[in-house]
Amino acid sequence: MMTGTIETTGNISAEKGGSIILQCHLSSTTAQVTQVNWEQQDQLLAICNADLGWHISPSFKDRVAPGPGLGLTLQSLTVNDTGEYFCIYHTYPDGTYTGRIFLEVLESSVAEHGARFQIP
């Protein structure tokens, strides 16, 4: 039975040209995490596999850094990076847990005026 829960940073915003850390945390389970995928709906960004280490998609290799931990750092943000990001935890014996983060990348002037999503 899957007892775990994924905690995420929820809805976040960042400035164009800046960076952001995407972070998820799996709790309430003793299941072993064997792999974590970071994805958008239509493509993989990165994978952290317990045996193979990190794989970063070539489409993102210049702008994505692994970590901290099982998280992912997105750099040199553009408005096109706005959207939904998913962390997929592959675990044994529970199975797969999925969390989602919505990122809005704001023009610097807008960000400076304090437009922010509330984190639930």
Partner: antibody
Amino acid sequence: DVQLQESGPGLVKPSQSLSLTCTVTGYSITSDYAWNWIRQFPGNKLDWMGYITYSGDTRYNPSLKSRISITRDTSKNQFFLRLNSVTTEDTATYYCARREVGQGFTYWGQGTLVTVSA
Amino acid sequence: DIVMTQSHKFMSTSVGDRVSITCKASQDVSTTVAWYQQKPGQSPKPLIYSASYRYTGVPDRFTGSGSGTDFTFTISSVQAEDLAVYYCQQHYSVPWTFGGGTKLEIN
């Protein structure tokens, strides 16, 4: 239990449009996931056509981009495929399927055969 | 597009045998490969995702392995009901693409 069911005409004339409906039961298409159309040609080759997400975003196979449209009717929990300017090469069994991020296509309809012929 | 190649269109085996089906990706797809079983007259059934993870309810005689460009799907002890076509699919990036299929024939 999640179920998907394709429906639509089994015969379409060349140059016309192919229109199919996928009716989903047991899960709301606005709750989560990407809702896809996949076809299988007579030689068994499988071809992903496109999807509409729970939020209404669409993505299409570039090979079909100028001819394909996927829409939905949330009140009926249905999503639709429209393929314009069909030729005999579009003869295939058409499936609708649900995809979960980080995985493959987890639920499939039973498929509907569409023949393009004069 | 990422091309998924299943080099064997047909494989012949006997009940109780171990059989392995291979799939090669045209570029590194890490572990983002799924496997499906399609029996005659039915829609594809998902068996494996992320190269080696079985879906709930899939018998443990079915296993997947591999990473990068080379992937293997193995049935440890073939049963008569395993007569089917098996497909690999990459879920790395759109357009999501499938292998051409390997038809398992039981002697």
